[in-house]
């Protein structure tokens, strides 16, 4: 089963930047996580695993990204009240089948304290 | 929690047709549910109360649907091999709260026999 | 429709080189791994090699190393298969095939590979 | 390298037939939970067609007569009732490590 809802904390602040959290079950081999900000494709990370299953990794729109086992991290630094928006982890299943999306998501407020450079 | 895999029959033929299967949670009063044929948007419906706890129906793009306390069906008619694509239900979640988004899909895959008009 | 059509096969002296081409269509060709795998006359299918998606990663089978590469041009939806120092146990139809992530999902028609005096 | 045997190496079959196949590999194919066996069928004079993946999964559109059974090393495809157009050659493949490698084949044949 794979669980639609980001009933985690998708959001880590830190040093004026932001880890968004996108997870994934751990039975999950090969897949597609997407960063969207609104509609738009911010990030993304692709593993997927040859016929003598080398794991490939790739990135169209290149972010600093963090995999494991069960989670991709994509990370946004120098925060400014213009990041503030819905954010959406957009996996694509290619393996174990069959082929699925999930789509999950939050909103990314951005407090005064979390900005990279606060005027004093 | 909010379920986001297609683990169900999301495709069901019956005479030339297509009906596509969107299920959500009972425990969603308010949603938007589209129909998306690969990125495209081929359907969608929207369900709100009003103060008065009345309820509105609405779709800015019009199929033939059925709702029920924890789904959407949307019908597609005359089957021919150009149906053949990845479908996928957005729903759009509203109340309860907090706001979310999960995509499910699935690949429609058109046999000869599920075909409105079949050469004899 | 998933179409993968091979060409380039034909007649080669043994010590000779063949270059093999595998035009795709009907998919996004840079999502997926690709392979080749030949099949000598009246015999079982062999393993050459493969390409992930955009050719940082190949692979090849034992009885081809350093003879055989294998590119692709994403832009041309094209899988390539150049051939040196052929030997006449490398005479065999070659399919190109596409990894569906799981398994070859997809196959070309074969081009037959002749390697002769 | 793995090493796939499979037996036997032909068979003569009438229509209706239940049709056992057997696959061997050298190491077991098993991990996270998978067995990273595959089934293809191929017909004289034609590519391989994929019929099963994980060892048991059948690909969409292939009949259910077709059934992939097994764990570890030791793996079946079984046609439940035999039709005369799955005469041809199957074929075992791992994608356990690499070089993937393919089991020798086996040629059914019409009685």
């Known amino acids: 089963e794979i669980n639609g809802s980001a009933n985690y904390e998708m959001f880590i602040f830190h040093n004026g930047g932001v880890q968004i959290l996108c997870k994934y079950p751990d039975i999950v081999q090969q897949f597609k996580m997407q960063l969207l900000k609104g509609g738009q494709i911010l990030c993304d990370l692709t593993k997927t695993k040859g016929s003598g299953n080398k794991v490939s990794i790739k990135s169209l729109k290149f972010c600093h990204s963090q995999l494991s086992n069960n989670s991709v991290s994509f990370f946004l630094y120098n925060l400014d009240r213009s990041h503030a928006n819905y954010y959406f982890c957009n996996l694509s299943i290619f393996d174990p089948p069959p082929f699925k999306v999930t789509l999950t998501g939050g909103y990314l407020h951005i407090y005064e304290s979390q900005l990279c450079c606060q005027l004093k | 929690e909010i379920n986001g895999s297609a683990n169900y029959e999301m495709f069901i033929f019956h005479n030339g047709g297509v009906q596509i299967l969107c299920k959500y949670p009972d425990i969603v009063q308010q949603f938007k549910m589209q129909l998306l044929k690969g990125g495209q948007i081929l359907c969608d419906l929207t369900k709100t109360k009003g103060s008065g706890n009345k309820v509105s129906i609405k779709s800015l793009k019009f199929c033939h649907s059925q709702l029920s306390n924890n789904s959407v069906s949307f019908f597609l008619y005359n089957l021919d091999r150009s149906h053949a694509n990845y479908y996928f239900c957005n729903l759009s979640i509203f109340d309860p709260p907090p706001f979310k988004v999960t995509l499910t899909g699935g690949y429609l895959h058109i046999y000869e026999s599920q075909l409105c008009c079949q050469l004899k | 429709e998933v179409q993968l059509v091979e060409s380039g096969g034909g007649l080669v002296k043994p010590g000779g080189s063949l270059k093999l081409s595998c035009a795709a269509s009907?998919?996004?060709?840079?999502?997926?791994?690709m392979d080749w795998v030949r099949q000598a006359p009246g015999k079982g299918l062999e393993w050459v090699g493969n390409i992930d998606h955009d050719g940082n990663i190949i692979n090849f089978a034992p009885s081809v190393k350093g003879r055989f590469t294998i590119s692709r041009d994403n832009a041309k939806n094209t899988l390539y298969l150049q051939m040196n120092s052929v030997k006449s146990e490398d005479t065999a139809t070659y399919y190109c095939a596409r990894w569906g992530h799981y398994a070859f999902d997809s196959w070309g028609q074969g081009t037959l590979v002749t390697v002769s005096s | 390298d793995i090493v796939m045997t499979q037996s036997p190496s032909s068979l003569a079959v009438s229509a209706g037939d239940k049709v056992t196949i057997n696959c061997k590999s050298s190491q077991s194919l098993l991990s996270s939970g998978y067995n990273y066996l595959i089934w293809y069928q191929q017909k004289t004079g034609q590519a391989p067609k994929l019929l099963i993946f994980?060892?048991?999964t059948r690909h969409t559109g292939v009949p259910d007569r077709f059934i992939g059974s097994g764990s570890g090393t030791d793996f079946t495809l079984t046609i439940t009732s035999f039709q005369t157009e799955d005469l041809g050659d199957y074929y075992c493949?791992?994608?356990?490590?690499?070089?993937?490698?393919f089991g020798p084949g086996t040629k059914l044949e019409i009685k």
């Open positions: 009907g998919f996004t060709f840079s999502d997926y791994w």
């Open positions: 493949q791992h994608h356990y490590s690499s070089p993937p490698t």
């Open positions: 994980y060892a048991s």
